[in-house]
Interface confidence: low
């Protein structure tokens, strides 16, 4: 009831707790002398469902039949209305609508660890919306029984607080759960099990790893387990991987040798335990052990390339470049690279250790046959050396790849294509595509990039260290034994018209013509590969269209003659530069008057 109900009563039939879909009868009646003063016939009783009127009646009592109540709680209040006064609350009642409990399903019991206690879980089924009591019963050998009750509205778990022991591991125990509420009761199917069925071992602990003689091939994992554990499963993976390697072991007694670990790799290890081959359940996974495997000597060979530069009649500069080994090939921290330079006929050799760089430059005589060997070393040893005979990579004209082209391919990619050399194409052992940023001065400090391509390929996509709006000098080498041929081309991944034109720095007169000299456009303003320069000129103070001369772009060129100027006429000259995307704005203007005689 809601309050003391001094003025009257509300009665509910058949019960305050009803089954979903049932009808309930609600009666509100006034106590003697509690109606409206003087006018008992004017008594007006009103029944509210929450705040909404659902019925009224003049007199001392009111009967109402209510159907269709929802699951849960509904509040009814009876009030008295008299003339010229506010409604007075008489009494009220709550109706609880629910359902009988469904049969609990999937009753399952577990004991965590050999020293743990038996606890059971089940599925309650649909919510009864009513106070429901669950009783869990366990019966064992020798008529032993245990019982535990749970009065939580959402009860689906109970712990008996008893410990099953392994003295008779095959003895049967039976559990059953019964749910009871005001509308009925229901029991689960019995669940019968033995000690071995329900004991779930604690996860292994104190996990350690040992590498005999600091070798990854002699690795043992150690751990501790509860006494009755028969089976273990191990899982391990590199820390940066999602995929686990799994191993099942029997009677491991807390140790197992792992044979397939990779060197110099951080691994995560976990172990789980079980008491019986086909009974019971696996423990939770142990806490992770993280450990790094030892280094092994590098495997694989360095990808080495080189560049030759003429210094003078007797000397040449050799620049060696190599790529880092992959993590799986390095198998440790590379401490240094060993470079050996040898003159093959005289046998002279020089060895140097390089740290912190993947390139090396030296000067050698132009005479003799030279070879280099480069290897990578970690704490355990060195990779097999990559040996290269130093040759003139472009000497064999017949080996030069033909029709080399370079085209933008998507963003920051250049697709290089070529045709095999005229000489027997089957002689080609491999192609090397080399690229570097184009610098007018031919700066040897500019990083060199390369990739190797199989002899049957006639294209390569270059994407490493490619920037937009930068021109690259691209060379394709065809290598065959100790011979090489090459072809080169300029290419860019993305281009715009240059941001500025060349700056004319001098105009000189030579035998009736003029020589124009200019400064190169800064690389960052070229916006791609330059195709042409244009020189424009017109008579000063003239409105006529300027004349122009278009010069194909060559890296080293920075002057050009013009011989079509009239003597003793003052001209204004300027220059522009063009990429495939368009023409730059013009550079500075210079005036010049040819002094010589007319032709």
């Amino acid at each position: 009831k809601i309050d003391a109900c001094k003025r009257g009563d509300v009665t509910v039939k058949p019960s305050h707790v009803i089954l979903l879909g049932s009808t309930v009868n609600i009666t509100c009646s006034l106590k003697p002398r509690q109606g409206c003063f003087h006018y008992s016939r004017r008594n007006k009783l009103i029944l509210y469902k929450f705040d909404r009127r659902i019925n009224f009646h003049h007199g001392h009592s009111l009967n109402s039949q209510v159907t269709g109540l929802p699951l849960g709680t509904t509040l009814f209040v009876c009030k008295l209305a008299c003339i010229n006064s506010d409604e007075i609350q008489i009494c009220g009642a709550e109706i609880f609508v629910g359902v009988a409990p469904e049969q609990p399903q999937n009753l399952s019991c577990i004991q965590k660890g050999e020293q743990g206690t038996v606890a059971c879980t089940w599925e309650r089924g649909r919510d009864t919306h009513l106070y429901t009591e669950y009783t869990l019963q366990l019966s064992g050998p020798k008529n032993l029984t245990w019982q535990k009750q749970c009065k939580d509205i959402y009860c689906d778990y109970l712990d008996f607080g008893i410990n099953l022991t392994p003295e008779s591991p095959e003895s049967n125990f039976t559990a059953k759960v019964t749910a009871v509420n005001s509308l009925g009761s229901s029991s689960s199917l019995p669940s019968t099990f033995t000690f071995l069925d329900i004991v779930r071992p604690l996860p292994p602990w104190d996990i350690r790893i040992k590498f005999q003689k600091a070798s990854v091939s002699r690795c043992t994992l150690y751990w501790r387990d509860e006494g009755l554990v028969l089976l273990n499963r191990l899982r391990y993976r590199p820390s940066n991987s999602r995929l686990w390697n799994m191993v099942n072991v029997t009677k491991a007694k807390g140790r197992h040798d792992l044979l397939d670990l990779k060197p110099f790799t951080e691994y995560e290890f976990q172990i789980s335990s079980k008491l019986h081959l086909y009974k019971g359940s696996w423990s939770d996974w142990s806490e992770s052990l993280r450990a790094q495997t030892p280094e092994e000597e590098p495997t694989g060979m360095l990808d080495v390339w080189y560049m030759k530069r003429h210094i003078d009649y007797s000397r040449q500069q050799i620049s060696l470049f190599w790529k880092n080994l992959s993590v799986s090939e390095a198998r440790g921290k590379i401490l240094h690279y060993q470079v050996t330079l040898q003159e093959l006929t005289g046998g002279k050799a020089m060895t140097q250790n390089i740290t912190g760089h993947t390139s090396w430059t030296t000067v050698i005589p132009r005479t003799g046959n030279w070879a280099v060997a480069v290897s990578a070393a970690n704490s355990k040893g060195s990779s097999l050396p990559t040996r290269i005979n130093i040759m003139n990579l472009c000497e064999a004209g017949l080996l030069a790849p033909r029709q080399v082209s370079a085209n933008s391919e998507g963003m920051d990619n250049i697709l290089v294509t070529w045709q095999p050399p005229r000489k027997d194409p089957s002689a080609v052992q491999e192609y090397v595509v080399e690229w570097r940023e184009l610098h007018p001065g031919g700066d040897t400090q500019v990083p060199l990039n390369w990739l190797r391509s199989r002899p049957y390929n006639v294209s390569a996509l270059i994407s490493e260290n490619i920037k937009s709006y930068i021109c690259y000098e691209i060379r394709v080498y065809a290598l065959s034994g100790d011979q090489g041929g090459c072809s080169s081309i300029l290419g860019n991944s993305k281009h715009k018209a240059p941001l500025s034109g060349p700056h004319i720095n001098a105009i000189t007169e030579e035998k009736g013509s003029i020589l124009i000299s200019w400064n190169s456009i800064p690389v960052q303003e070229q916006m791609g590969c330059l195709l042409h320069y244009r020189i424009y000129w017109k008579e000063r103070d003239s409105n006529s269209q300027p004349q122009l001369c278009e010069i194909p772009y060559r890296v080293s060129q920075n002057s050009h003659p013009i011989n079509s100027l009239q003597p003793r006429v003052t001209y204004v000259l300027w220059m522009t530069a063009l990429t495939a995307a368009g023409e730059s704005s013009h550079g500075n203007e210079r005036e010049f008057c040819l002094q010589g005689k007319a032709n």
Partner: nanobody
Framework: QVQLQESGGGLVQPGGSLRLSCAAS????????MGWYRQVPGKQRELVAE???????TYVDSVEGRFTISRDNAKNTVYLQMNSLKPEDTAVYYC??????????????WGQGTQVTVSS
């Protein structure tokens, strides 16, 4: 095969910002290009921004100056910072990773996509 997992999409008002993330796993050593594409219903998927292993970036003209692509090599993750968002940026944004080897596209892997809605 490279697995790509995008996150960070959502509803934002015009002028607002979002940061999309794309985590790569699997054969990540082979990736040359990572980028973001977008698609509106009934239209072709279009490139928004792309970043090469060399670290250079490219943007479609309509997002230049507003969107920034970046990456965290240690986490194998590429990001797209989207500022000054406009209603026409509404689309499903897809992460893409391309692996080129010796001039051939050996892998072209896509994420599941994340919805970006710009609306007041």
């Amino acid at each position: 095969q490279v697995q790509l997992q995008e996150s960070g999409g959502g509803l934002v008002q015009p002028g607002g910002s979002l940061r999309l993330s794309c985590a790569a796993s699997g054969s990540i050593l082979r990736i040359n290009l990572m980028g973001w594409y977008r698609q509106v219903p009934g239209k072709q998927r279009e490139l928004v921004a792309e970043m090469s292993t060399g670290g250079s970036t490219t943007y479609v003209d309509s997002v230049e100056g507003r969107f920034t692509i970046s990456r965290d090599n240690a986490k194998n993750t590429v990001y797209l910072q989207m500022n000054s968002l406009k209603p026409e940026d509404t689309a499903v944004y897809y992460c893409n990773a391309k692996a080129w080897q010796l001039g051939r596209l050996e892998n072209d892997d896509w994420g599941q996509g994340t919805q970006v809605t710009v609306s007041s």
